[in-house]
Interface confidence: low
Amino acid sequence: GYKAEVMVSQVYSGSLRVLNRHFSQDLTRRESSAFRSETAKAQKMLKELITSTRLGTYYNSSSVYSFGEGPLTCFFWFILQIPEHRRLMLSPEVVQALLVEELLSTVNSSAAVPYRAEYEVDPEGLVILEASVKDIAALNSTLGCYRYSYVGQGQVLRLKGPDHLASSCLWHLQGPKDLMLKLRLEWTLAECRDRLAMYDVAGPLEKRLITSVYGCSRQEPVVEVLASGAIMAVVWKKGLHSYYDPFVLSVQPVVFQACEVNLTLDNRLDSQGVLSTPYFPSYYSPQTHCSWHLTVPSLDYGLALWFDAYALRRQKYDLPCTQGQWTIQNRRLCGLRILQPYAERIPVVATAGITINFTSQISLTGPGVRVHYGLYNQSDPCPGEFLCSVNGLCVPACDGVKDCPNGLDERNCVCRATFQCKEDSTCISLPKVCDGQPDCLNGSDEEQCQEGVPCGTFTFQCEDRSCVKKPNPQCDGRPDCRDGSDEEHCDCGLQGPSSRIVGGAVSSEGEWPWQASLQVRGRHICGGALIADRWVITAAHCFQEDSMASTVLWTVFLGKVWQNSRWPGEVSFKVSRLLLHPYHEEDSHDYDVALLQLDHPVVRSAAVRPVCLPARSHFFEPGLHCWITGWGALREGGPISNALQKVDVQLIPQDLCSEVYRYQVTPRMLCAGYRKGKKDACQGDSGGPLVCKALSGRWFLAGLVSWGLGCGRPNYFGVYTRITGVISWIQQVVT
C-alpha cells in the first residue's frame, strides 16, 4: 500500500541586514508599538522571501524576535517541514545559498517582488544557522526579559542586572563589525545557584555555546569570555531567589589579536618565554587559530612546553578536541584541563624548527591557555632527576615517593631515600652525609662537602642556583652555600621559653608559637601555622563549603593555648586574602593547602613566631618522630579540645601508607602515626602543623593535617599535606 512520507521539523536561526531602515531604541522594547509594527512587517517579509524559493513547499512557521544595529538587523528563526530523506540536503549552508540566490536575482529587477515592498535586504548580510526546537523554546522563555545592547569601539558597557521577577533573561550584545566582543563576568556573592550561558550568536543556540558557568564559582571568581565576532548572547537562569545580583556583567569590543609568532631560541636551558592565546587569561574564542614557529639553535636540544593545569593527550578515533586542538610536528593532540602541572617534550630532529598550532575545534571554549617554552638537553633531559614520561616533568628519583603516576621514578633504585656510597654501592641514611663522620668504606659520604656539586634529588639549591651535597643545610648555623643563602630567612622555628609539662599532652604558652586557631563567629574551625609576618598556612578543605569561602567570616588567633579564655600573649587578625592552591581537588584531597594573608603584620613575641619552611629538597626521614598540635577532638566524633594538644607521631614510608589507603595517597601527601593507631589528629585539627625538629633545634613544617580514616584507628595513619610538594607555590605567593 501507499506509505505517507515521514516529515521532520528542521529549525533554522539567523539574521539579515536591511539597508533602507535604521535601528532605534524603541525597537529594544518589545512592548513598544514601534517594535510590534516593525516585527509584523519583518515577519511578513521573511515569510515572503522563504516562500519565493523552492523552500516554500516546506515552509511551516517563522518569527522575527529582535532587532539590532547595522543599519537595521533583524534576528529570526523559521521552521521547515522536510521529508526525512531530504533532511541532510537542506543544511543551513544550502538554505542560506538558496535565499541569497533569490535576493540577488531580484536586486536589479523592475518587477514587483512582495518581500521587497518595504525592505531592501542586503544579500551579503544574510546568515543562516542550524537550530533546534529546544533552542527556540529556550529563546522564548527569555523573551519576557530580553535586553539588546550595542557597544561602541572603546566603550566598556556595564549590563543592567536581570529582572528578579523573571526566571530567565537574555542579553543580546552587538559591537562594531570586524571587532570581537569580550564579556567580563564577576561573581559578587560567595554563594548562589545562578547559571549563565554565553553564546557565539544572537540567541541561545546549543551548538554555538561558548561556555556556561554556574553558582558563584570560587575557582573562577572572574571569567572573561571572547566571542568570535561582534555578536554574542548571554542567558541567565535564576537560582535561589535573591534581591542582589550575584554577578556583574560588562562587555567591550576588542580588536582581533594575531596569534602567529616566529621565535628563535637562545643556547640555554630552562624557560625562555611564554606563548598564550589572545587576551589571556580570557577564555579563547571560538575559531581561534594560533601558529607558533620556534627555531632551536642546535640538535642537542629538544623543545619543552610547560603547561599549568592543562595537558596534551592523544585523541582516539579522530573525535573533535573539546578543549583545544594542537598539532605539533604533524601529531594531533587534544588539550585537557587537569589539576596538575604538565610538560610536552618535543624531540628536535631537524634544524628547520618546530611549528605548533592551536585551534578551537568547536564553539565550546575554555580558559585561555598559556605555555612556557624552553630547551632541554636531549641526551640528559633531567640532570640529577628522573624524566616522568607520563607528564613530561622532571621529578626526584629514588626518594621514597612515587612522583610519577606510573611509579617508575622509584623503580630500579639501588638506594631508595638514602645515600649511595661510591665504593661499594652500600646505602647510608641521609643525615650521615657531610656530618663530619665517614660512614662509607672510603669516606665518600664526606667528600665534596665544602664545594658545589651537580644538583640532584637531595641536594640543596642555593640562591645562585649552585647546589650543595649536605642534606637539609638550612638554618643550621653553618653557611654551606658560597652565597650563604642556606642561612638566610632563619628567624623561625624556635620555641618560646615554656614551663612544659613533661610527657603531658597539653601544650604550654609559647611552646608552639606558630600555631594558629582559625575561627568563624567565635568557633574554632581549623588549625594553621604562621609562616611569615603576614601569612598563615592551613588546609584548603577548611574552606570547602561555599558558606566558608568568604574572608570576612574568618578570624585568626595566634599565641592561643586555651579556647575558652584569653591570655596576654594572644593576638587576633582579620583575613585580607584567602588563596587556595590552584590544583586543590576536594574529592582526592590533593594539594590540600591554602594561604591566608593577615590584615596586618604580626609583632613577634615569645608566644608568636613563625615556623621554618623547608626547601623542596628537604628530606623528612621516614621513622622520624615529629609533632602535631591542635584543638581537635580528643576522640573520634567527640567535641573539640579546650586546651592546645600536642602528640608525637612517626613519619611513615610513602609506599606503606599508600598501600593502607589503597593508592589514594598522592606525592603531595605525607603520612604519620603508628600501626597500632591511638596517636593521631582528629576533627578540628585540620590545617594544623606537623613539625619536625632539626639537629639545630629549629622546627620545620613538614605537613598540614589533611585527612585520614577516622582518628587513631589501628592500621590507618594520619595523612598530611606534604609541604615540600607545595613549597614552590607557597614561596611564589608569599614572596
Epitope: K402, P405, N406, G407, V660, R662
Partner: antibody
C-alpha cells in the same frame, strides 16, 4: 555488586587470533587498573597483562609480549585482550581482574573464559 | 617452575591451624607487598589477604598473613571443610616487571 564477565573464548588453531572481552558492572570502571590473568588446565595462575585506569600505560608478561594487546573502552566499561600468533601453550582459562590503581591487588575476578589452541 | 615457591599440598584436621609458606627473593617479596588468593574448586580466585597482612572486608579473621624478609606465610585457624581450596601467593617482581604467582598449595581438611 561488582561483576566482571569475560567472553570470546573458544577453540582456535595455532598461529590464529582471538579477541577476549570483559564487561564490568557495579563498579566505577574508570578508577581502576584492569588485568588479565590466565590459568592453564590443572596448573597455577600466570599474570598476562595490565592496563592503567587512564589507558596511559600497559605492561605484559614476557611470554605474551609482542603477541597480545590489552585495551579498554572506559565509556563501555569494557576490557579487551587481542591475542595474535596463538600457540598451544596459550591454552588456558583467561580471567579479567580488577586491580587497585597502580597496584597488583586483584580484588575482583571474572568467572573466566576458556581458550583452547589446538590444530 | 614458579618464581615464588609454595608447598604443593598441606593437610590438617578440622578446627586445627595450618600455615602455608611462600618463598621468593629480594626483587619480589623482599621489596614488595604479598597478596594471597583462595581458589575454591571450579571457581575463580578470590582475594584473601592484601599487602602482607591486610584482611579485605568480608574475609573471615581466621585467615591472617605475615611477611619476613623474602618469605611470607598464610595462616588459617579453626579449619573448616569449606576452606578446602588452592591457595596462591603473589607479588610484583621488580626485575621481571611483572606480577608473579606461587605454584599454589592445595589444602585438604582431613
Amino acid at each position: 555488586q561488582v561483576q566482571l564477565v569475560e567472553s570470546g573464548g573458544g577453540v582456535v588453531q595455532p598461529g590464529r587470533s582471538l579477541r577476549l572481552s570483559c564487561t564490568a558492572s557495579g563498579v566505577t570502571f574508570t578508577n581502576f587498573d584492569m588485568h588479565w590473568v590466565r590459568q592453564t588446565p590443572g596448573k597455577g595462575l600466570e599474570w598476562v597483562a595490565v592496563i592503567w585506569y587512564d589507558e596511559s600505560y600497559s605492561y605484559y608478561a614476557d611470554s605474551v609480549q609482542g603477541r597480545f594487546t590489552i585495551s579498554r573502552d572506559n565509556s563501555k566499561n569494557s576490557l579487551y585482550l587481542q591475542m595474535n600468533s596463538l600457540r598451544a601453550d596459550d591454552t588456558a582459562v583467561y580471567y579479567c581482574a580488577r586491580g587497585w590503581t597502580g597496584s597488583y591487588v586483584f580484588d575482583y575476578w571474572g568467572q573466566g573464559t576458556l581458550v583452547t589452541v589446538s590444530s | 617452575q614458579s618464581v615464588l615457591t609454595q608447598p604443593p599440598s598441606v593437610s590438617e584436621a578440622p578446627r586445627q591451624r595450618v600455615t602455608i609458606s611462600c618463598s621468593g627473593s629480594s626483587s619480589n617479596i623482599g621489596n614488595n607487598a604479598v597478596n594471597w588468593y583462595q581458589q575454591l574448586p571450579g571457581k575463580a580466585p578470590k582475594l584473601l589477604i592484601s599487602y602482607d597482612d591486610l584482611l579485605p572486608s568480608g574475609v573471615s579473621d581466621r585467615f591472617s598473613g605475615s611477611k619476613s624478609g623474602t618469605s611470607a606465610s598464610l595462616a588459617i585457624s579453626g579449619l573448616q571443610s569449606a576452606d578446602e581450596a588452592d591457595y596462591y601467593c603473589a607479588a610484583w617482581d621488580d626485575s621481571l616487571n611483572a606480577v608473579v604467582f606461587g605454584g599454589g598449595t592445595k589444602l585438604t581438611v582431613l
